[in-house]
C-alpha cells in the first residue's frame, strides 16, 4: 500500500496473508467463510501457508494469530493466466477458523459499486514503488470507486465488467504484495487487489480490483459443492 497508514488493530479480522517458504508474504487474501478464503487467481501457488489474525508483517508470534494450510485452490474457470479478467480464486483451509476478535469472515457484497463509493483497501505490500519496501504492520488506505468510463480511459482496452477502478490522489495506491487483499465498502467485501499501473501510484492510473458483485453466485455454489 503506497501512502496508506497503519490499520487500527483488530479492524481487519478477515485479512489473511499467503506465505511462501516459510514466512515470505506473496499475496493477501480475505476470509469469507469459516473455512474459505478469497484471493486473486494470479496468486495461485502449489504450496503455501495461510496466516490470519496477525497484525505485523514479521513472523513474530501474536496471541491472536491462527495458522492454516491451503488444501484446495479453485481459480474461477474464466481466469486465464496471466490475464486479469475473472481474477479470483477460492482457497479451502485445512480446518475451520476459531472465531475471535482477530479472525472473522466478511460478507461479499452482492451490489456492484457505484462511482464515488468510499472504500478501504489493506495489505502488507510494498510501501514504495518501483523499489520494494516492507511495512512493519498492516497498512490501510481510503480509496474511492471511479466510474467505469474513467477506468476505461485510464486503461484503454484492458477493462471489463469483472473489474472496477478505485483510487485517490496521486501517490496513493495498492501495490506489489497486496494482490488478493480486500477492498471493503460499506462493511462488505467489494473487491480484491488485482492490478494497476507499473510502477504503482502514478497520476491518473488508479488501482484495478476484481469486481466481486459479479461472482457471488459462483462463490456460494463453489463453497457449497466443496464443503
Amino acid at each position: 500500500i503506497i501512502n496508506g497508514s497503519d490499520c487500527d488493530m483488530h479492524t481487519q479480522p478477515w485479512q489473511a496473508a499467503l506465505l511462501l517458504r516459510p514466512n515470505q508474504l506473496y499475496c493477501g487474501a480475505v476470509l469469507v467463510h469459516p473455512q474459505w478464503l478469497l484471493t486473486a487467481a494470479h496468486c495461485r501457488k502449489k504450496v503455501f501457508r495461510v496466516r490470519l489474525g496477525h497484525y505485523s508483517l514479521s513472523p513474530v508470534y501474536e496471541s491472536g494469530q491462527q495458522m492454516f494450510q491451503g488444501v484446495k485452490s479453485i481459480p474461477h474457470p474464466g481466469y486465464s493466466h496471466p490475464g486479469h479478467s475473472n481474477d479470483l480464486m477460492l482457497i479451502k483451509l485445512n480446518r475451520r477458523i476459531r472465531p475471535t476478535k482477530d479472525v472473522r469472515p466478511i460478507n461479499v457484497s452482492s451490489h456492484c459499486p457505484s462511482a464515488g463509493t468510499k472504500c478501504l483497501v489493506s495489505g502488507w505490500g510494498t510501501t514504495k514503488s518501483p523499489q520494494v519496501h516492507f511495512p512493519k504492520v498492516l497498512q490501510c488506505l481510503n480509496i474511492s470507486v471511479l466510474s467505469q468510463k474513467r477506468c476505461e480511459d485510464a486503461y484503454p482496452r484492458q477493462i471489463d465488467d469483472t473489474m472496477f477502478c478505485a483510487g485517490d490522489k496521486a501517490g496513493r495506491d495498492s501495490c506489489q504484495g497486496d494482490s488478493g487483499g480486500p477492498v471493503v465498502c460499506n462493511g462488505s467485501l467489494q473487491g480484491l487487489v488485482s492490478w494497476g499501473d507499473y510502477p504503482c501510484a502514478r497520476p491518473n492510473r488508479p488501482g484495478v480490483y476484481t469486481n466481486l458483485c459479479k461472482f457471488t453466485k459462483w462463490i456460494q455454489e463453489t463453497i457449497q459443492a466443496n464443503s
Partner: antibody, heavy 124, light 107 residues
C-alpha cells in the same frame, strides 16, 4: 509464439543519440500483464538493465542512466523504443529487449522472453 | 544500488558432475525477487529460475535454486553438454542489477 526483434543503426557517433526499436510479434504490447525492458551487454562483459516501460507509457529507469535514457511505446505498431543521448565508447554493447510478467503479487517472474540482440558500436 | 557478486568466476567441470554457483548480494534481497539466467555465446540470456527457486517453463529439473537474504545458489545436479555456458543472477528488489556471471566450462 511471442518474438521480440531489435532494430536500429549499428554505428553511432560519439555525443549523438542512439535509437533502437523493439518490435513485438505473436503477442500484444497493450496488455496489463506485462512490462517491457531494455538490457545491454558490453563486449565480453555482464548484463546491465537500462529500463522498463508498461503499456500505459509509465517508465522505470536505471538511476545511473536516467539522465540520458528515454523509453517510449507505440501500441499501434506493437513496438517500444530506446533513446540514449550523448553516447560515448562506453555505450558500445549488444542491446536486448525483453518481456517481464507483471501483477501485484509480491513476486518477480523474471524476464521470460528476449530478443536476439543488436550490436551498437559508438565510434567516430 | 544492490551489488551482486557471483563466484567462482569460472567453474571447470566434466559432464555428469554437480555444479554449484553462488550469488551474494551487498544487502538483503527478498528471495521472491531473485532470478537466474543462462547465456550461451552469441545468444540472448534465457530465464532459468525466478523467485529464487521456481523453474521457468521448459527448464529441466536438474536446475534448482535456493537461498535467502544475501546468499543464493544455483545448482545443476548433473551437467549435460548443453549446460556449459555463463550464468547470471539478477535481483529486482530495488533498481534491477545483474551479477557479473559465472562461466561453467568443460574441464
Amino acid at each position: 509464439q511471442l518474438q521480440l526483434q531489435e532494430s536500429g543503426p549499428g554505428l553511432v557517433k560519439p555525443s549523438e543519440t542512439l535509437s533502437l526499436t523493439c518490435t513485438v510479434s505473436g503477442g500484444s504490447i497493450p496488455s496489463s500483464s506485462y512490462y517491457w525492458s531494455w538490457i545491454r551487454q558490453p563486449p565480453g562483459k555482464g548484463l546491465e538493465w537500462i529500463g522498463n516501460i508498461y503499456y500505459s507509457g509509465s517508465t522505470y529507469y536505471n538511476p545511473s542512466l536516467k539522465s540520458r535514457v528515454t523509453i517510449s511505446v507505440d501500441t499501434s505498431k506493437n513496438q517500444f523504443s530506446l533513446k540514449l543521448s550523448s553516447v560515448t565508447a562506453a555505450d558500445t554493447a549488444v542491446y536486448y529487449c525483453a518481456r517481464g510478467e507483471y501483477d501485484r503479487s509480491y513476486y518477480y517472474w523474471g524476464l521470460d522472453v528476449w530478443g536476439q540482440g543488436t550490436t551498437v558500436t559508438v565510434s567516430s | 544500488e544492490i551489488v551482486l557478486t557471483q563466484s567462482p568466476g569460472t567453474l571447470s567441470l566434466s559432464p555428469g558432475e554437480r555444479a554449484t554457483l553462488s550469488c551474494r548480494a551487498s544487502q538483503s534481497v527478498s528471495s521472491s525477487y531473485l532470478a537466474w539466467y543462462q547465456q550461451k555465446p552469441g545468444q540472448a540470456p534465457r530465464l532459468l529460475i525466478y523467485g529464487a527457486s521456481s523453474r521457468a517453463t521448459g527448464i529441466p529439473d536438474r536446475f534448482s535454486g535456493s537461498g535467502s537474504g544475501t546468499d543464493f545458489t544455483l545448482t545443476i545436479s548433473r551437467l549435460e553438454p548443453e549446460d556449459f555456458a555463463v550464468y547470471y543472477c539478477q535481483q529486482a528488489f530495488s533498481s534491477p542489477t545483474f551479477g557479473g556471471g559465472t562461466k561453467v566450462e568443460i574441464k
